[in-house]
């Protein structure tokens, strides 16, 4: 998350600039923590303070965006349902999974329905 402007090398915040191109947040030491993100626009350059969370689970962070299918049916056995996501966009240096599977508990209503279905099938 970008914090306050740290240093403006050329130009100033007041200068008109149509489109800034921002580089990745690079931690000052190690792989996470406080660092800087560099931006350029024409002849102007800015550095803003940013932070890479140390507990970031990269596959599911803002680094990786997925397009998800609809949730599958509730599995009465596990009490969960699953959906699959296909990678839509990754930050340039983010090593994202091509596809991910997400599970969540079924709502009590769907759980009951799934159990009822299972019971019927056994008869």
């Amino acid at each position: 998350v970008a914090k306050k402007k740290d240093k403006v090398k050329k130009g100033g915040p007041g200068s008109e600039c149509a489109e800034w191109a921002w580089g990745p947040c690079t931690p000052s030491s190690k792989d996470c923590g406080v660092g800087f993100r560099e931006g350029t626009c024409g002849a102007q350059t800015q550095r803003i303070r940013c932070r890479v969370p140390c507990n970031w689970k990269k596959e599911f962070g803002a680094d990786c965006k997925y397009k998800f299918e609809n949730w599958g049916a509730c599995d009465g056995g596990t009490g969960t349902k699953v959906r699959q996501g296909t990678l839509k966009k990754a930050r340039y240096n983010a090593q994202c999974q091509e596809t991910i599977r997400v599970t969540k508990p079924c709502t009590p209503k769907t759980k009951a329905k799934a159990k009822a279905k299972k019971g019927k099938g056994k008869d």
Epitope: A21, W22, G23, P24, T26, P27, D31, E38, T40, T86, L87, K88, K89, A90, Y92, N93, A94, Q95, C96, Q97, E98
Partner: antibody, heavy 117, light 107 residues
Framework: QVQLVQSGAEVKKPGHSVKVSCKAS????????MNWVRQAPGQGLEWIGM????????ILNQKFKDKATLTVDISTSTAYMELSSPRSEDTAVYYC??????????WGQGTLVTVSS | EIVLTQSPATLSLSPGERATLSCRAS??????LHWYQQKPGQAPRLLIK???QSISGIPARFSGSGPGTDFTLTISSVEPEDFAVYYC?????????FGGGTKLEIK
């Protein structure tokens, strides 16, 4: 596996724009950054910019901000790079490459653009 | 922009020898450094990504080290097909930049 096939060589007069295409087949075209790189005869590699097909986010090398325009056509899985008002110093082989930090990249075969009067 | 300086410009070796190619960044770029091989008339080919990560299909004799500002590509025992130009590239900040290249030639 991604295959990138680029359009054929072009010879242009100075000032006449040129558009190079890069058609992708194989894995999902829309998920990965498409880079454009050029190489002048006998020289090294120079990054022009990149575009993400999912939303057309574009990051250009400032050196090329008035020179190159990057676009994509999702329906045909094709990326384009247009050079406006090229000069003789823009004579180079232009490459497209599809980048994934997880699996690496795939490159097109290159397109030679010759600008000569 | 980040400047990458490769050395030596030319490296003359015989097949079977060990090759050590260097790439120095003008500022720290973490591990965001990649190595490419290019042969005449061909597109570059990615050998190593993120300083030391191997690429599927690339022989195990190619290895890389980093991170920080000083990076090395090592070819443990040079094969005849390895004679080519090698480029490093950084993806730490825009614009992406390449080193000037190291030509590995037969002694």
């Amino acid at each position: 596996q991604v295959q990138l096939v680029q359009s054929g060589a072009e010879v242009k007069k100075p000032g006449h724009s040129v558009k190079v295409s890069c058609k992708a087949s194989g894995q999902s075209f829309s998920s990965y950054w498409m880079n454009w790189v050029r190489q002048a005869p006998g020289q090294g590699l120079e990054w022009i910019g990149m575009i993400h097909p999912s939303d057309s986010e574009t990051i250009l090398n400032q050196k090329f901000k008035d020179k190159a325009t990057l676009t994509v056509d999702i329906s045909t899985s094709t990326a384009y790079m247009e050079l406006s008002s090229p000069r003789s110093e823009d004579t180079a082989v232009y490459y497209c490459s599809s980048w994934s930090a997880k699996r690496g990249d795939f490159w097109g075969q290159g397109t030679l653009v010759t600008v000569s009067s | 922009e980040i400047v990458l300086t490769q050395s030596p410009a030319t490296l003359s070796l015989s097949p079977g020898e060990r090759a050590t190619l260097s790439c120095r960044a003008s500022e720290s770029i973490s591990n965001n450094l990649h190595w490419y091989q290019q042969k005449p008339g061909q597109a570059p080919r990615l050998l190593i990504k993120y300083a030391s990560q191997s690429i599927s299909g690339i022989p195990a004799r190619f290895s890389g080290s980093g991170p920080g500002t000083d990076f090395t590509l090592t070819i443990s025992s040079v094969e005849p097909e390895d004679f080519a130009v090698y480029y490093c590239q950084q993806s730490n900040s825009w614009p992406l930049t390449f080193g000037g290249g190291t030509k590995l030639e037969i002694k």
